[in-house]
């Protein structure tokens, strides 16, 4: 939240943004870096073995607002964070898995930080 009198002007960002990519790298990417006119993202999700897999990459400007909104999907634990403030800003993103539903436990929920 901005304090009174503090400028709300957005920080100018690079027209073309470079992002770290992993498992979402286009074929022409070099050194796990992709380029976009949109956003960098980092996502954590359960894979098909229950592993908390982290992937990252570039999102084009078109539709990225929706993709970065992180709408909950039933029966899928997934969280995404996006950034635009500087090149490779997604290196510092730290999305966390949404908590398990209580019905997954028979002896009450386990507390997660």
């Amino acid at each position: 939240k901005k304090e009174d009198g503090e400028s709300t002007a957005p920080t100018p960002r690079p027209k073309i943004l470079r992002c770290k990519c992993h498992h979402h790298c286009p074929e022409d990417s070099v050194n796990n870096i992709c380029s976009t006119d949109g956003y960098c993202f980092t996502m954590i999700e359960e894979d098909d073995s229950g592993m908390p897999v982290v992937t990252s990459g570039c999102l084009g400007l078109e539709g990225s607002d929706f993709q970065c909104r992180d709408t909950p999907i039933p029966h899928q634990r997934r969280s995404i964070e996006c950034c635009t403030e500087r090149n490779e800003c997604n290196k510092d993103l730290h999305p966390t898995l949404p908590p398990l539903k209580n019905r997954d436990f028979v002896d009450g929920p386990i507390h997660h930080k």
């Epitope: 359960e46 098909d48 982290v54 992937t55 634990r77 966390t96 436990f105």
Partner: antibody
Framework: QVQLQQPGAELVKPGASVKLSCKAS????????MHWVKQRPGRGLEWIGR????????KYNEKFKSKATLTVDKPSSTACMQLSSLTSEDSAVYYC?????????WGTGTTVTVSS | DIVMTQSQKFMSTSVGDRVSVTCKAS??????VFWYQQKPGQSPKALIY???YRYSGVPDRFTGSGSGTDFTLTISNVQSEDLADYFC?????????FGDGTKLELR
């Protein structure tokens, strides 16, 4: 809380098979994946494979495909691993581990000794 | 298969010290790495997932860092109960593979 109970030890003869069990409690058995890991003294840890208790779907380490068979018994919330054609190389501690994203609980381990 | 190398088999430390256990992957695994602690006669206990996320209940003196091929588990203010074996594991691709472990001993 989430717990995985395994028998302490199994003594088996070379060439025989053994079925190891892993009884889960404290959570809904079908909502976590069950992994199996082998540990030999001085040889580190090896991932054998995993099973989805809900669908019964499995994924194996190629190295253990002809050695291990993973199954589940949903009514008793028990995962099992059958090891076949046992040799001294199979003497080890075998762990089951229940995984779900940011939860990772290991069983107590079963020591398998292959000896005539 | 991806090879996880823990080059230091043993590390000596004193209570109160800060110690860093390292692990190197043979190819890029992003941040898809677990760290485990194992005490003699016990099963492994998960400390860290996704290279830097602490499991619930793990003391905050345990910190994971790194990405790509180089990973570090740092224990600040080492306690006597931290003397154990520490293993890294990659889960970026199958088969899942472990490092050979680093034994933390009292100097």
């Amino acid at each position: 809380q989430v717990q995985l109970q395994q028998p302490g030890a199994e003594l088996v003869k070379p060439g025989a098979s053994v079925k190891l069990s892993c009884k889960a409690s404290g959570y809904t058995f079908t909502t976590y994946w069950m992994h199996w890991v082998k540990q030999r003294p001085g040889r580190g840890l090896e991932w054998i494979g995993r099973i989805d208790p809900n669908s019964g779907g499995t994924k194996y380490n190629e190295k253990f495909k002809s050695k291990a068979t993973l199954t589940v018994d949903k009514p008793s919330s028990t995962a099992c691993m059958q090891l076949s054609s046992l040799t001294s190389e199979d003497s080890a501690v075998y762990y089951c581990a229940s995984r779900r994203g940011d939860i990772d609980v290991w069983g107590t381990g079963t020591t398998v000794t292959v000896s005539s | 298969d991806i090879v996880m190398t823990q080059s230091q088999k043993f590390m000596s430390t004193s209570v109160g010290d800060r110690v860093s256990v390292t692990c190197k992957a043979s190819q890029n695994v992003g941040t898809n790495v677990f760290w485990y602690q194992q005490k003699p006669g016990q099963s492994p206990k998960a400390l860290i997932y996704a290279a830097s996320y602490r499991y619930s209940g793990v003391p905050d003196r345990f910190t994971g860092s790194g990405s790509g091929t180089d990973f570090t588990l740092t224990i600040s203010n080492v306690q006597s109960e931290d003397l154990a074996d520490y293993f890294c594991q990659q889960y970026d691709s199958y088969p899942l593979t472990f490092g050979d472990g680093t034994k933390l001993e009292l100097r």
